[in-house]
Amino acid sequence: QGWQAFRNDATEVIPGLGEYPEPPPENNQTMNRAENGGRPPHHPYDAKDVSEYSCRELHYTRFLTDGPCRSAKPVTELVCSGQCGPARLLPNAIGRVKWWRPNGPDFRCIPDRYRAQRVQLLCPGGAAPRSRKVRLVASCKCKRLTRFHNQSELKDFGPETARPQKGRKPRPGARGAKANQAELENAY
């Protein structure tokens, strides 16, 4: 009886092990900046300059439902979101032929540890409360991806993180770049 059985009030399936939902965009752009101290305890990354290069533990508080029953208290759920940066894939081109060249291995921001939490569900019509155990993400980590991972697994990544296509050069290609653009930082 995992948490696949539960739904929140918006009928969004609470994710199970190995599922990584795409969270909505954040409004507070400074929330995870290092200087603001917004990092949760086991956060593997901290985007000092908010950018696409960030692996964040996003906290969501919501009620869980199972059929007509609803949790007595909201449950705080953690979702791992973002890219383990800096970008390690860069566009390259010779003439009209374009490919992605790697500058380093690809990492994915995924759950590291889980915690079990017992949730009491209140049911309508005077039915006895139910108790269920749910498994929630406790922390995130940046885990290595290989080129053999299914391309569809990367659907929630930005354009700079899609794996190179078959036609890419085996070694990184040579393409100049401007001297430092605005610095994009992460803390692992």
Partner: antibody, heavy 123, light 107 residues
């Protein structure tokens, strides 16, 4: 010949900052991310972070919590590592290292290292 | 962070001996394990990557094996130039981490 040449030894007081440089030659600088690794006297190796010379994007070991900044200058093929608020336990040899790639095995490794820069923090 | 534990921390051996160094990861790291050799006052040098791939130019007496959490570096017949400290390094999860090192000394 591919090589990384680092700046000379530094002696700093606690609370000061140090900036170590690493000049790359023999390869296209922007093709490889540059990493920094340090080694305290008689101790093992500790990875500090990396920088992408193309974008300037950097990633750091959380242990250094905002004390470290890595930058590059592509016009001179030089990477820099600045460590602030130095403490006595930052006394170490600091290495820059290039991350090489084997396409067959899709694997990465530190294939070229600088000679190391000794940073001594002492009052 | 993934902890990399090397054993032994030091060993004494003679030229011609077979030497085995082990490295254990605190989590599964697949085959993303590299080995480096370091001599006093020098930078580390890559020997083996992806658990068992010998870097070009590294003598064939060096070999690596393992998968998951347990890895081994073997020197089949120790040579005078092999007396050094050896480090393993995982490349599976950020931050990258190294083992504490194994110092191979002359008996």
């Amino acid at each position: 010949e591919v090589q990384l040449v680092q700046s000379g030894a530094e002696v700093k007081k606690p609370g000061a900052s140090v900036k170590v440089s690493c000049k790359a030659s023999g390869y296209t600088f922007t093709d490889y991310n540059m990493h920094w690794v340090r080694q305290a006297p008689g101790q093992g190796l500790e990875w500090m972070g990396e920088i992408n010379p193309n974008s300037g994007g950097a990633g750091y070991n959380q242990k250094f919590k905002g004390r470290v900044t890595m930058t590059t200058d592509t016009s001179t093929s030089t990477a820099y590592m600045e460590l602030r608020s130095l403490r006595s336990d930052d006394t170490a040899v600091y290495y820059c290292a290039r991350l090489g790639y084997d396409d067959i095995y899709d694997d990465w490794y530190f294939d070229v290292w600088g000679q190391g820069t000794t940073v001594t923090v002492s009052s | 962070d993934i902890q990399m534990t090397q054993s032994p921390s030091s060993l004494s051996a003679s030229v011609g001996d077979r030497v085995t160094i082990t490295c254990r990861a605190s989590q599964d790291i697949s085959n993303y394990l590299n080995w480096y050799q370091q001599k006093p006052g020098k930078a580390p040098k890559l020997l083996i990557y992806h658990t068992s791939r010998l870097l070009s130019g590294v003598p064939s007496r060096f070999s690596g094996s393992g998968s998951g959490t347990d890895f081994t570096l073997t020197i089949s017949s120790l040579q005078p130039e092999d007396f050094a400290t050896y480090y393993c390094q995982q490349g599976d999860t950020l931050p990258y981490t190294f083992g504490g090192g194994t110092k191979v000394e002359i008996k």
